[in-house]
Structures are given as C-alpha cells and as structure tokens.
C-alpha cells in the first residue's frame, strides 16, 4: 500500500562532501518497525546508497561500512550522507517501509538533488 | 532461489521442550518480519508466533504465551522456536512463513514443515 | 473455535464457479486490515492465492478473485477445475490479538 514521503528538492553538499537531508512520511499505520533506504538516481540508473530497519524512537542503525548515518523523530528521519564527491552529484530518492506490525506500507520520496563541489586544493606556499 | 527449511521437529513426552530452527536464504533476512504457523493433524492453520526482522517486536497467540519464546539470529539467517512445556494438543506441523516480496505482509513462503508430536 | 469465519465445505462440477466467504470482525477485517487467502493441497505447505484482499501474486490464475466489504470477505473460483480440489483459508492480522488469524478453512471438492 503507498504512502506519501516528502524531502526537499535540493541540497548542497559543504565542503567535507556531507549532505544531510530530511525524510518525512505520513504514516497510515502504527509502525513499531520501519526501514528506511536511500536510492541515487543518475543516468537513468538507481543504485542503492544505504538501508536501515529502526525501531520507532530508536537510532537507525546503518551496516558498520555505510556512508550514511541517521536519526529519527516520529515520522521524520534525518539522513546524513557522507564523503561525497562531485562525481556523487545526483539525485537521492528516500524509500521508507513500515515494515511491522500489519500493514505493510511503502513510498517513495521526489528524491533529493545533492550537488557536491570538490574543493579547490590548497596552493602550494613557500615558508 | 527463497527457501526455508524448519528443522528439530520430533516425538517429545508431555512437559517436555523442543527447540525448531528454520533456516532462510535467498532473501534479506533481516529486513522482514517472521512467523510460526501450525497445523494439527486434520485441523486448520493457526498462527503461533511472529517476530520483527530486527527481532524488537514479538507476538505469541494466547494459546502457547509463557510457554513458547520466538528468536532470530539475523548473522546465521535462521528463526527459532523454543517449545516448553508441551502439551498433547501442541501436536502438529510447524511451518515457519514470511512475506519478502517488499509488495505486501501476506505469507508468500512457506517452508515444508516439520512435525512434532506430543505422546507418552 | 477460529476468529474468522468460513464455511466447512464447498463444492462445485467443473467450469462452475464457486464463492467461499470469510466472516471477521471489527478488530480484523473490519478495522481495515487486508485478507488473504491461501490453498493447500494435500500434504503440501499453504500457498499464497490472493493477498491484499483482491490481488493475485505472479503464476496464480485469474480464475481466482476475491473481494472484501465491511467485516467479510470471499474468494471466487470460476471455470472450476479438478486440480482446485484444496483446503481454502483466509487470514488477516488482528489488532486486539496482535496477531495473525486464519479462518477454520473451507474443503472445496470438485464433483464429477
């Protein structure tokens, strides 16, 4: 069943390549379980990025190797992306799922466009 | 492919406890909720125990509350079903079922069961 | 005695089409949780035939339907065949049981 998820249209990137963003979604149901997954579209192609299961009023908790890090507050998710750069550029689409008890909801976000500037190397400087 | 295969099913006397495992593969474990469903020999489904795919969230039926404790490990892909306590009536075909199509929560696989008997 | 109501038996000839129906409550069906139905053939493990009250999952066909209002629910066979011979449930998660419920199953025989 769907269910509507909302993030912002745009986000830059600071100059560490960390973009952080909001995931919201207007749950129908009373989740306890819901997962969250972050989606890059670039090129007509979507790639995964990251997913965490969280228990509500819990931390999301992402695999010890993912770019991402989160944390969440009723029914908005705080998504913060990591060590982007500005081959990353692209558009980030929040895919959320209740997934326990029943029923069993999904949406799927507009999508995030995140624009990654690599910063300019510092000159060389004669001491 | 999706597959579950319960295990540890057996003939055990009244009082007695029995431990089910049902392994999965093929699909992300972790990511969906788990259920025990049984069936008494000639008799109807009945839905025993579930639990959520992080294993935070655990519902018993009325029928085995206190006697009966649902568990994953999410490393090994594997549900459990610990069994205390059995009775006669506890006697039946355990099935482990979940839903991993990422569309629905209705049981879309079924592992082949496993039979436990309660006899002296 | 199961939550959800079905009738014991059913039975048609070939080509017919069948109804069973399946009787909830305000806790269940009428509280807006989809049905589901699943057939099991003899000595198998169930299959799922109809989730969401009224979708069929790949492979199924569309000689089956089912629909839901208020508390109730029915499955609808048509074009009755041999191999539907089966034990028929629904089931649909329950809020005041926190739980999943099924009903008893209905016995559906093909005649002839």
């Known amino acids: 069943k769907a269910m509507h998820v909302a993030q912002p249209a745009v986000v830059l990137a600071n100059s560490r390549g960390t973009a952080s963003f909001v995931c919201e979604y207007a749950s129908p149901g009373k989740a306890t379980e819901v997962r969250v997954t972050v989606l890059r579209q670039a090129d007509s192609q979507v790639t995964e990025v990251c997913a965490a299961t969280y228990m509500m009023g819990n931390e999301l908790t992402f695999l010890d190797d993912s770019i991402c890090t989160g944390t969440s507050s009723g029914n908005q998710v705080n998504l913060t992306i990591q060590g982007l750069r500005a081959m990353d550029t692209g558009l980030y689409i929040c895919k959320v799922e209740l997934m326990y008890p029943p029923p069993y909801y999904m949406g799927i976000g507009n999508g995030t466009q995140i624009y990654v500037i690599d910063p300019e190397p510092c000159p060389d400087s004669d001491f | 492919e999706v597959q579950l295969l319960e295990s540890g099913g057996g003939l055990v006397q009244p009082g007695g406890s029995l431990r089910l495992s049902c392994a999965a593969s093929?699909?992300?474990?972790?990511?969906?909720?788990m259920s025990w469903v049984r069936q008494a020999p000639g008799k109807g489904l009945e839905w025993v125990s579930g639990i959520s795919g992080s294993g935070g969230y655990i519902h018993y039926a009325d029928s085995v509350k206190g006697r009966f404790t649902i568990s994953r490990d999410n490393s090994k892909n594997t549900l459990y079903l610990q069994m205390n306590s059995l009775r006669a009536e506890d006697t039946a075909v355990y099935y482990c079922?979940?839903?991993?199509?990422?569309?629905?929560?209705?049981?879309?696989?079924w592992g082949q069961g496993t039979l436990v008997t309660v006899s002296s | 005695q199961s939550v959800l109501t079905q009738p014991p038996s059913a039975s048609g000839t070939p080509g017919q089409r069948v109804t069973i129906s399946c009787t909830g409550s305000?806790?269940?069906?009428?509280?807006?949780?989809?049905v589901h139905w699943y057939q099991q053939l003899p000595g198998t493990a169930p299959k799922l035939l109809i989730y969401?009250?009224?979708k069929r999952p790949s492979g199924v066909p569309d000689r089956f339907s089912g629909s839901k209002s208020g508390t109730s629910a029915s499955l609808a066979i048509s074009g009755l065949r041999s191999e539907d011979e089966a034990d028929y449930y629904c089931a649909a998660w329950d809020d005041s049981l926190n739980g999943w419920v099924f009903g008893g199953g209905t016995k559906l025989t093909v005649l002839g």
């Open positions: 969401d009250n009224n």
């Open positions: 093929g699909f992300t474990f972790s990511s969906y909720a």
């Open positions: 305000s806790s269940n069906i009428g509280a807006g949780y989809d």
């Open positions: 079922a979940t839903y991993s199509s990422g569309l629905h929560d209705a049981f879309d696989i």
